[in-house]
């Protein structure tokens, strides 16, 4: 059986954000999955793309957010699983040769995904093939289903293809073209931050903001560091002692309508130790069980 | 070339339900939205719903739920628009359209006693 | 629903000249995900159906000559006929896709 949350190189303690660029080398973040997304169903096609996480040979953990259509943005429409792509064991985007891609089976938002406030942000992918895991795909452990989450001041990881670049805004992107994705992939270490201060900050802030308790926050007061556009359903991992494995605790969700990184505006995370019972059950095939590791 | 025909004119009674046929041609049929739009001398454009014919998957303009109902027939790659309790505010040209680009040639609905 | 407001509601000019025409949206109309502005230009002549001219606020639709150009981000929004034609004769509508579709008044263009 495949072990979950042990990659076969060691992650470093010193890590730099995705803000800013620090590239992950091979191997760092096996259970780390390219999501691209083409929408054909529309007029001109939409294409976007997001991360997720190997839970097992033949699942992908992400948020839901990335496998909606994005066309009607007050509308919860999930993309048919035709126009779904899955890279596994992907380092640089340019280069696609050493990768696994699958095509998916079936995708599955959660039923209560609310596209105002982001509360329920979880999917799953099923693929079509399982994935030949190796040295650079393996999967990532569930933690165990309790409602509290991750404490506050612990330190996590989070890896992704989105924005590296803070100083370009969304619609000097639109207007200039500029590249401003990461062709490597990049990775953050990032603190836990509280609910009362998360909630707090969002509150503060004109706009209609909502931290749920199925929602945690990470990141620095002074900003800096931090998940950006594209970096979306992506795996927030923490370490844990005990079993001496990572445990996707988050997924990259939302954060605040300013740059990326800004100063005391936390990235939110959806808070994966909710939705354990329900990722199990809807992965609830004889093989899917079997296949799936979770913390104990 | 890909075309959207459309039935053919409809004078209706205040309170009976029409429905309204647009064939599509030049394409696969069941991976594109077909969209209906809703046009009234002096209202402009107003945009009733989409349907998903592959699917059956539909979104609907709030201000038309309980009024458009849309179903498609993958085998004639047929889409249908079905209007009920009609009154003289129904009274309009209608469109079909796939997604954002190609328009049909329009059916013109009038109802009166 | 996104409120579209279009200026001015017509317009008259001489053949030749350059035409620019707005659209405005109640909110933003530019996805972060895709990077794309949902709004696009229609054409509606007499007694005819519309027919697209731009999608993504300014990408030009195969067919459409090129003195039309739509361009704008967010929630302004301008399309320009660089050199009208007696053919241009139409009424522009925009139409937003960003959530459920509203269209604008529409602006009637006459050619004197």
């Known amino acids: 059986l495949p072990v979950c949350g042990q990659p076969s190189r060691a992650l470093p303690n010193l890590v730099k954000r995705i803000i800013g660029g620090r590239n992950a080398e091979l191997g760092l973040f096996p259970w780390q999955a390219l999501i691209v997304v083409e929408d054909t169903s529309r007029i001109p096609n939409d294409k976007w793309f997001g991360s997720g996480a190997l839970l097992s040979e033949s699942w992908i953990l992400t948020a839901a957010h990335v496998l909606r259509s994005q066309r009607r943005d007050n509308t919860v429409i999930p993309v048919s699983k035709d126009h779904v792509t899955v890279y596994l064991g992907l380092h640089d985007v340019r280069d696609k040769s050493g990768a696994v891609n699958s095509s998916a089976a079936r995708v599955v938002l959660h039923p209560d995904f609310n596209i105002q406030n982001y509360n329920h942000d979880i999917a799953l992918v099923q693929l079509q093939e399982p994935v030949p895991l190796g040295a650079h795909v393996m999967p990532i452990c569930l933690p165990r289903p309790e409602p509290e989450g991750p404490a506050p001041h612990m330190l996590g990881l989070v890896a992704g293809w989105g924005i590296s670049n803070p100083n370009v805004t969304v619609d000097e992107i639109i207007i200039s073209g500029t590249r401003t994705l990461s062709d490597v992939l990049q990775y953050v270490k990032l603190p836990v931050v509280s609910h009362a201060e998360c909630k707090a900050s969002y509150e503060s802030r004109s706009g209609n903001y909502s931290v749920t308790e199925n929602m945690f926050c990470a990141g620095y007061y002074e900003g800096g560091k931090d998940t950006c556009l594209g970096d979306s359903g992506g795996a927030f991992v923490i370490f844990d002692e005990m079993s001496q494995r990572w445990v996707a605790q988050g997924l990259v969700s939302w954060g605040g309508p300013e740059e990326c990184g800004s100063k005391q505006v936390y990235g939110v995370y959806t808070k994966v130790s909710n939705y354990v019972d329900w990722l199990l059950e809807e992965m609830n095939s004889p093989r899917g069980v079997r296949e799936l590791q979770v913390e104990r | 070339q890909v075309q959207l025909k459309q039935s053919g004119a409809e004078l209706m009674k205040p309170g009976a339900s029409v429905k309204l046929s647009c064939k599509a041609t030049g394409y696969t049929f069941t991976g594109k939205w077909i969209e209906w739009v809703k046009q009234r001398p002096g209202h402009g454009l107003e945009w009733i719903g989409e349907?998903?014919?592959?699917?059956?998957?539909?979104n609907y303009n709030e201000k038309f739920k309980g009024k458009a109902t849309f179903t498609a027939d993958s085998s004639s790659n047929t889409a249908y628009m079905q209007l009920s309790s009609l009154t003289t505010e129904d009274s309009a040209m209608y469109y079909c359209l796939r997604s954002e680009d190609v328009w049909g040639t329009g059916t013109t609905v009038t109802v009166s006693s | 629903d996104i409120v579209m407001t279009q200026s001015p509601s017509s317009l008259a000019v001489s053949a030749g000249e350059k035409v620019t025409m707005s659209c405005k949206s109640s909110?933003?109309?530019?996805?972060?995900?895709?990077?794309?502005?949902?709004l696009a230009w229609y054409q509606q002549k007499p007694g005819q159906s519309p027919k697209l001219l731009i999608y993504?606020?300014?990408t030009r639709e195969s067919g459409v000559p090129d003195r039309f150009t739509g361009s704008g981000s967010g929630t302004d929004f301008t399309l320009t006929i660089s050199s009208v034609q007696a053919e241009d004769l139409a009424v522009y509508y925009c139409k937003q896709s960003y959530n459920i579709p509203t269209f604008g008044g529409g602006t009637k263009l006459e050619i004197k």
């Open positions: 993504w606020a300014s």
């Open positions: 909110q933003s109309l530019l996805n972060s995900r895709t990077r794309k502005n949902y």
């Open positions: 349907i998903l014919p592959g699917t059956g998957s539909t």
